[in-house]
Interface confidence: medium
């Protein structure tokens, strides 16, 4: 079905589309005289060069060396396939509903699935992963520990931009009046530690207390800010005299 | 190629069934296959009800079952399955799924389209 084989066309002779219509758009044979239904990504497409034609736009018929086991299964497709459709642009893109999707296809195909659901349609917002506020993954631990030792605490945040992580020693004054102290501050046993991960668009953050002094003593709170909002968590350090006075829950060790 | 239903059977009114149709056959690839499921009751003519395209990611009802229930398809046990919630007694009719080749994004909803058929399963609703 190569175009230097294509007779008068014939509409007449055409096989009918499906009378629901086709999901992905009509698209045309390798004579460019009956419609078809376009091929969808992961769909089969291809035999002559020709065939390329039989994607949904957007995509391209990519040739397979091998036969795909994927959702297509052993006979991928019938005689003469020899590829599958892919999405032309394989960069992420951020949809109406807030889902990051893996290419613009990818979207095409939700939307697609939200309308036969008698849902809204699903549009591109932006290129690129959407934006979220930060969440913490993993807060920070309440520690209890003996004076001179050392001790820290962790934060994992994430964000979309990435945020930006900071540590305060929140102090309470009278009358329930909270005020916060940007940390390291002018501390000399306190060191603040930062780095991206362990995910993408992931930052953990420590703080080091080395040695352990009375006044160290109090809430520390981990706070992760983006364009999108902030989030925050925190956790109290407790200095006792001696290990003794260190509380133990039945079936776990205290945090040291 | 052989279709073959199960899950059929006598419900009350506002019950529930899930309906299988199990597929076999050697040449059979079911994974290469779009499904439906129709009804025949009494003196009517078969009446397609839902449909799932080949890779299970598109879904199709009509509006006498849309709401109440639902299509889906496991490839790797060959079956497609089909939810029937709060059952009114207009649903009673023997069951029967479909199958046709394609691999496009793509609802069949007339009995000519499909190519193999299951022996059907009886639904009775009573009030």
């Known amino acids: 079905s190569s175009s230097d084989t294509c007779g008068p066309c014939e509409p007449a002779s055409c096989p009918p589309l499906p009378p629901l219509g086709c999901l992905l758009g009509e698209t045309r044979d390798a004579c460019g005289c009956c419609p078809m239904c376009a091929r969808g990504e992961g769909e089969p497409c291809g035999g002559g060069g020709a065939g390329r034609g039989y994607c949904a736009p957007g995509m391209e018929c990519v040739k397979s060396r091998k036969r795909r086991k994927g959702k297509a299964g052993a006979a991928a497709g019938g005689p003469g396939v020899s590829g599958v459709c892919v999405c032309k642009s394989r960069y992420p893109v951020c949809g109406s509903d807030g889902t990051t999707y893996p290419s613009g296809c990818q979207l095409r195909a939700a939307s697609q699935r939200a309308e036969s659901r008698g849902e809204k349609a699903i549009t591109q917002v932006s290129k690129g992963t959407c934006e979220q506020g930060p969440s913490i993954v993993t807060p920070p631990k309440d520690i209890w520990n003996v004076t001179g030792a050392q001790v820290y605490l962790s934060c994992e945040v994430i964000g979309i931009p990435t945020p930006v992580l900071i540590w305060n020693k929140v102090k309470r004054g009278h009358y329930g009046v909270q005020r916060t102290e940007l940390l390291p501050g002018d501390r000399d046993n306190l060191a603040i530690q930062t780095r991206g991960g362990p995910e993408k668009h992931e930052v953990t953050g420590w703080v080091l207390v080395s040695p352990l002094s009375k006044e160290d003593a109090g809430e520390y709170e981990c706070h992760a800010s983006n364009s999108q909002g902030q989030a925050s968590a925190s956790a109290k350090i407790t200095v006792v005299d001696a290990l003794h006075e260190i509380p133990v829950k039945k079936g776990e060790g205290a945090e040291l | 190629v052989q279709l073959q239903e199960s899950g059929g059977g006598l419900v009350q009114t506002g019950g529930s069934l899930r309906l299988s149709c199990a597929a076999s056959?050697?040449?059979?690839?079911?994974?290469?296959?779009?499904m439906g499921w129709f009804r025949h009751a009494p003196g009517k003519e078969r009446e397609f009800l839902t449909a799932?395209?080949?890779?299970?990611?598109?879904?199709y009802y009509t509006d006498s079952v849309k709401g109440r229930s639902t299509i889906s398809r496991d490839n790797a046990k060959n079956t497609v399955y089909l939810q029937l919630n709060n059952l009114k007694p207009e649903d009673t009719a023997v069951y029967y799924c479909?199958?046709?080749?394609?691999?496009?994004?793509?609802?069949?909803?007339?009995?000519?389209?499909?190519?193999?058929w299951g022996q059907g399963t009886q639904v009775t609703v009573s009030s």
């Open positions: 479909a199958a046709k080749f394609s691999q496009v994004s793509a609802f069949f909803a007339t009995v000519s389209e499909y190519e193999y």
């Open positions: 056959g050697r040449s059979f690839t079911f994974s290469s296959y779009a």
């Open positions: 799932i395209t080949w890779s299970g990611d598109y879904t």
